[in-house]
Interface confidence: low
Amino acid sequence: AGVFELQIHSFGPGPGPGAPRSPCSARLPCRLFFRVCLKPGLSEEAAESPCALGAALSARGPVYTEQPGAPAPDLPLPDGLLQVPFRDAWPGTFSFIIETWREELGDQIGGPAWSLLARVAGRRRLAAGGPWARDIQRAGAWELRFSYRARCEPPAVGTACTRLCRPRSAPSRCGPGLRPCAPLEDECEAPLVCRAGCSPEHGFCEQPGECRCLEGWTGPLCTVPVSTSSCLSPRGPSSATTGCLVPGPGPCDGNPCANGGSCSETPRSFECTCPRGFYGLRCEVSGVTCADGPCFNGGLCVGGADPDSAYICHCPPGFQGSNCEKRVDRCSLQPCRNGGLCLDLGHALRCRCRAGFAGPRCEHDLDDCAGRACANGGTCVEGGGAHRCSCALGFGGRDCRERADPCAARPCAHGGRCYAHFSGLVCACAPGYMGARCEFPVHPDGASALPAAPPGLRPGDPQRYLAGVIAVIVVVVIAIVAGIVVLVISRKKRMAKYEKAEIKEMGEMHRELNA
């Protein structure tokens, strides 16, 4: 047994052009953490395959926010080592995957969100008990600097952590059959029980008389590197061409036990001894229960109360994955109705609504006329989110914002002359016609062709006639002004009511997003 230790020295932009964008911003501060996955052997394995030697997660690093304009620095790292305990022999050759994760710390739904920043992988040879090995790996524009080592946990010693040491039985000397166990001067080594001549560096045994080889070594005494072995066939009872004898495929070859389980052969098959937290024929079933809190980002855990039942995470909006660890593009869920635009601000969703709609999700079809849709005294005509304006004289366009020439439509009938006026238009009628638009003949029976005069006025009294026209215009102007005042007051009342509703809606939206 022993521990693989990983020390991250720095994570930051690598050399050369194309510096990566900082993972954090003022609006979305974040912090980093690391995950290491170890697999035995030198085979290139997919990131998804089990971490058969074990895995570990670092603590969270300090909170970090990008410093604009400053050269991109190495990012602040978590304290301490990543430690991956291994229970059996250290394989000597191993594959590793180191992942750099970002934890966003905004006010997003369900708490912090995780996302993978970088993943590096490698294959190395390493003897337990040796010095720290330094390494630099690049992933895209990022660079990771780290050191690693494997060390044995007492009472195990040796390059594979398979030789056992026992404490001295007396202060001055080792007990019967025990020798001092370097490098631990106060401990003694258990008698070697492996096959005589079994390589102490590349072989190990768990039962007396056997010599099992570390990955990458072969031969009866584990002294022949696999790459230089004269055996052409690494499998099968023998190789006729070389006469070298190699063990046939055993049920434990390639270690069928997942998640760090150890394999032992049985007369008919194999048996996996699983590490804590895993079970099943191949240790493939996680023994994690809801009590372990496996659901991230506020996910709700169901099941898993006892070791024989799996757990299921029910994820909150915005998250997915078996542990709710993946953040989804919340705008892809089309939360904004009625053609609203979705903005994912990280800490919240916003919908930018089209004209005629409102509410946190643009779900309210507005009473258009509450939004002061028609300018310059125009009257709003309701119409299913698309308002129309009936404009006051002198104005036109969709919202009555455009000045119109009231005489352009030739409103004066029977040759009457049109004059634009601040309150609209005035028609000066041709002789024989009367009315606001010169629409009425003075004598419908055609009895008189004299210029028309309003009742009560004698023909030939132009001053009085003009005074009457002016009086009518004044009355019309007063009526229009009064109408505008009434409209403005009623609209203000409606707007106040609408704004109160909007404030209430925004409050509800805020509560909903922070829930």
Epitope: S25, A26, R27, P29, P62, V63, Y64, T65, E66, Q67, P68, G69, A70, P73, P76, D79, L105
Partner: antibody, heavy 119, light 107 residues
Framework: EVQLVQSGAEVKKPGASVKVSCKAS????????MHWVRQAPGQRLEWMGV????????NYNQEFKGRVTITVDTSASTAYMELSSLRSEDTAVYYC????????????WGQGTTVTVSS | DIVMTQSPDSLAVSLGERATINCRAT??????LAWYQQKPGQTNKLLIF???TLQSGVPDRFSGSGSGTDFTLTISSLQAEDVAVYYC?????????FGGGTKVEIK
């Protein structure tokens, strides 16, 4: 020499808004964030928010429940802090402060602007 | 939010003597603590950041120590110009928060 010069004292009525300016000189304005901090009489300093002048992204203290807005005018190398719906407890000295580096917080401060809210 | 508690509220120390101010956070802030000096009529001055890093231009009689939740600002030999109010501030996470301040006077 780095300098942050703030606008003069203000007296406001409850319910009104105040906008305090902070003119930066002696460094590249868009390369450093700007914090706003206030201190009520006899009270501790209180962080209000921060802005990245390069793209106007901001982060606010939720304690102010949306009443605070921080903006910048990069052409004038000036940051602004607007506080709305003022109440008497907003009477304080308001400071702008430059954020220095990844690890260090506010290395240069403005002289402060006194805002008095009184009916 | 992280609450920062400073002690003592005020401190009277003889010239040339050592002054010690403590600051405690309600949860671990690693080493991310700053100390500021506030004097009437002057702009606030950053003394220490990241727990123990001395800001350039600050006399080396000022020192900071601590990590996690407990921190200390020490003035090894108090000078007349050190009379001021001192504030601690966590810069570990938003919202940044300050201690209540410690007034340092000459005995």
């Amino acid at each position: 020499e780095v300098q942050l010069v703030q606008s003069g004292a203000e007296v406001k009525k409850p319910g009104a808004s105040v906008k305090v300016s902070c003119k930066a000189s002696g460094y590249t304005f868009t390369s450093y964030w700007m914090h706003w901090v206030r201190q009520a009489p006899g009270q501790r300093l209180e962080w209000m928010g921060v802005i990245d002048p390069s793209d106007s992204l901001a982060n606010y203290n939720q304690e102010f429940k949306g009443r605070v807005t921080i903006t910048v005018d990069t052409s004038a190398s000036t940051a602004y802090m607007e506080l709305s719906s003022l109440r008497s407890e907003d009477t304080a000295v308001y400071y702008c402060a430059r954020d220095s580096t990844v690890v260090a917080p506010m290395d240069y401060w403005g002289q402060g602007t006194t805002v008095t809210v009184s009916s | 939010d992280i609450v920062m508690t400073q002690s003592p509220d005020s401190l009277a120390v003889s010239l040339g003597e050592r002054a010690t101010i403590n600051c405690r956070a309600t949860k671990s802030i690693s080493k991310y603590l700053a100390w500021y000096q506030q004097k009437p009529g002057q702009t606030n001055k950053l003394l220490i950041f990241s727990g123990s890093t001395l800001q350039s231009g600050v006399p080396d009689r000022f020192s900071g120590s601590g990590s996690g939740t407990d921190f200390t600002l020490t003035i090894s030999s108090l000078q007349a110009e050190d009379v001021a109010v001192y504030y601690c501030q966590q810069h570990h996470e938003y919202p940044y928060t300050f201690g209540g301040g410690t007034k340092v006077e000459i005995k």
